[in-house]
Amino acid sequence: SIPWNLERIIPAWHQTEEDRSPDGSSQVEVYLLDTSIQGAHREIEGRVTITDFNSVPEEDGTRFHRQASKCDSHGTHLAGVVSGRDAGVAKGTSLHSLRVLNCQGKGTVSGTLIGLEFIRKSQLIQPSGPLVVLLPLAGGYSRILNAACRHLARTGVVLVAAAGNFRDDACLYSPASAPEVITVGATNAQDQPVTLGTLGTNFGRCVDLFAPGKDIIGASSDCSTCFMSQSGTSQAAAHVAGIVARMLSREPTLTLAELRQRLIHFSTKDVINMAWFPEDQQVLTPNLVATLPPSTHETGGQLLCRTVWSAHSGPTRTATATARCAPEEELLSCSSFSRSGRRRGDWIEAIGGQQVCKALNAFGGEGVYAVARCCLVPRANCSIHNTPAARAGLETHVHCHQKDHVLTGCSFHWEVEDLSVRRQPALRSRRQPGQCVGHQAASVYASCCHAPGLECKIKEHGISGPSEQVTVACEAGWTLTGCNVLPGASLTLGAYSVDNLCVARVHDTARADRTSGEATVAAAICCRSRPSAKASWVQ
Amino acid sequence: QDEDGDYEELMLALPSQEDGLADEAAHVATATFRRCSKEAWRLPGTYIVVLMEETQRLQIEQTAHRLQTRAARRGYVIKVLHIFYDLFPGFLVKMSSDLLGLALKLPHVEYIEEDSFVFAQ
């Protein structure tokens, strides 16, 4: 009788499998920044090192009694979820505990920073195999805590953080809001978001994926073989830390970008009921529940992409939104989305040597999101070709003119504020293969890439009748790299990618006004990587 | 993800001359002060002074020492609780909030963040 959470995240074919690094030893080390832990618990004894690190605030209240089993409860449970002999995700993994939370589960940003620095020092003094840092804690947004996570991540450490239990936007909390950490929300046995009293799991664009976090069986500090169930995004993060430890145990050279992309790609999709989240957060929150991915040897050189949403631009006339990929990822396309439909489009530009996706609000708009499609493309060479807006009535064409470069995405940015004078941009695969086509007043940006064996094609789907959205999916074996909405309705909200699905959103009023002849078209650019083939555009 | 969401950033506009010291007057505060948007989670009196990324080891210590010296001139005792070298240049200090204006004008300071609570999730 295996606990539900392990059954959920570890597919049947993995259940009995031992993860070992190529040389036979499991060298992954997980650092847990939490409460003190009961190292003698049978679930974790012999595999946990309780460091002498202790940086916690005093407990509140004069009548507070320090009871060892209560002080150790949170950390012991998480240590058990990560590497417990029976109820652990990564059963053989060695764990180091740092005490940054007191007996009431409270810590400080400064204590957490000193803990992260302790890990960095340990790494410098005695370099070891892959390191995973589990941060099952959250405070208000902290620029310095996020910066420290970024610095540590850039040394090759993989950080996994709880999204937070505040039933709120995870971007308002740290370290959950740090882009370099893998941020985990919590789901229950029915794959639904976890409710915790009046609160529950955090959500939003800062969450990377969800994992089991309700009624999780794990080591109890009440006795050395006791178990108990606990709930929260800490438990969810511990599952993902365990999965990451297992992935690194098999393949110690996997990078943070590869780990994140694989976690996303192999997660269970579309099982979460998004209605639990506030309406404005539903589109931003990933509908993904973590599972242990197969090794890269079993899955070959797939093209892996994820969608990264920017922060909301805000409503000012010239407000811009910026979405960034991780340093190792390629920005293959950029689109934009506005709930009011008042946006002036999107484009890709280089900032500090990195390509970023930008979107611009329009006059009277409530703000926009920039939506980046970030992909792992080995040995890629990508560039942006843009053409300024054409004169009235003329089309603007941009294609990839370099040899062996293929079109992975199109962006369009309108110079004019007046939404009524412009038509939406167009992208037509039949007439102009591999071209971005913009109508009057639109600057057009083509994202062009060369990589061994990269091939792409356009897939379109149009709906003439009333519809809030039009979708088009890339077929199996192909990965969505670009997503645009083509002319039809007088007002579209924009386009974005959800996994391998391109979603074009239409304004309600536009639906009502539209004549049947004006189809709204979702245009997807689908690519695949076939290392043996040459880069090509598929007709 | 890293844009400052619900976060308080204050530019402390303070007299540049303070006590007429030439080196202080020369350095106009461009650094910002930040604190948690949730008041109950703040820890006033403890601050993380974050220095520019390229700040050298010796300069970190000098900046902390300079803050102590200048605070002492004003009759304040401050305590440097920790110096950060390995992840980012900076230091943790226990001091009166009266000294924030002074601290923000120190060379190499990028921003100062008030300490705050984190919680088990």
Epitope: S1, P3, A40, H41, R42, E43, G84, R85, D86, A87, I217, S220, D222, C223, S224, T225, C226, F227 | -
Partner: antibody, heavy 118, light 108 residues
């Protein structure tokens, strides 16, 4: 080899008390904890409590809290079970057993019979 | 408090037959369950620890399996000396040591 030898059993009046002893030999006494377990005639095993000889820390089954007291004398490699206010239902064979907390009871004494009767 | 339920209460078998005793825990206990044998007039003896490991000197015909909440003690071929009472046991927080009610294996 490891040996545990109980003594002190016999006939006790209702309301009376008794002290059972368990002498250990064949290993380092303070390295293991000890449990006292009893078995009423024809019934199953019932755990009373344990002691860690190293620290002297004890833990009891709530049913025996205040009725049983476990102690030890490290110099004599002996542990004790003091039982007060005995009643007829306390009639049982009392065993001491060696353990590591969270592990099995790997060695048992032969048991000593306590009969509570007037 | 964890409750251990053993079944059957009595098992009537002949020598050479296979005996299977189950123990169900009311809560998850991982693999931290032990089995004991007690013959009339003797102290219990540890047979299996941590669900599946044979204690020192225990013959190979005794085996344990299971984890979580469901456990099994199997005697592959009963010898005359195996007719006895068998108990399962776990650790918990309150009380720390919990025994099952016992299963009597008797000669048919």
């Amino acid at each position: 080899q490891v040996q545990l030898l109980e003594s002190g059993g016999g006939l006790v009046q209702p309301g009376g008390s008794l002290r059972l002893s368990c002498k250990a030999s064949g290993y380092t006494f303070s390295s293991y904890s000890f449990s006292w377990v009893r078995q009423a005639p024809g019934k199953g095993l019932e755990w009373i409590g344990y002691i860690d000889p190293g620290s002297g820390g004890t833990k009891y089954n709530q049913k025996f809290q205040g009725k049983a007291t476990i102690s030890r004398d490290n110099s004599k490699n002996t542990l004790y079970l003091q039982m007060n206010s005995l009643r007829a239902e306390d009639t049982a064979v009392y065993y001491c057993a060696r353990q590591r907390v969270g592990y099995s009871l790997d060695y048992w004494g032969q048991g000593t019979l306590v009969t509570v009767s007037s | 408090e964890i409750v251990l339920t053993q079944s059957p209460a009595t098992l009537s078998l002949s020598p050479g037959e296979r005996a299977t005793i189950t123990c169900r825990a009311s809560q998850y206990v991982g693999s931290y369950l032990n089995w004991y044998q007690q013959k009339p007039g003797q102290a219990p003896r540890l047979l299996i620890y941590d669900a599946s490991n044979r204690a020192t000197g225990i013959p190979a015909r005794f085996s344990g399996s299971g984890s979580g909440t469901d456990f099994t003690l199997t005697i592959s071929s009963l010898e005359p000396e195996d007719f006895a009472v068998y108990y399962c046991q776990v650790w918990d927080s309150s009380p720390p040591v919990v025994f099952g009610g016992g299963t009597k294996v008797e000669i048919k």
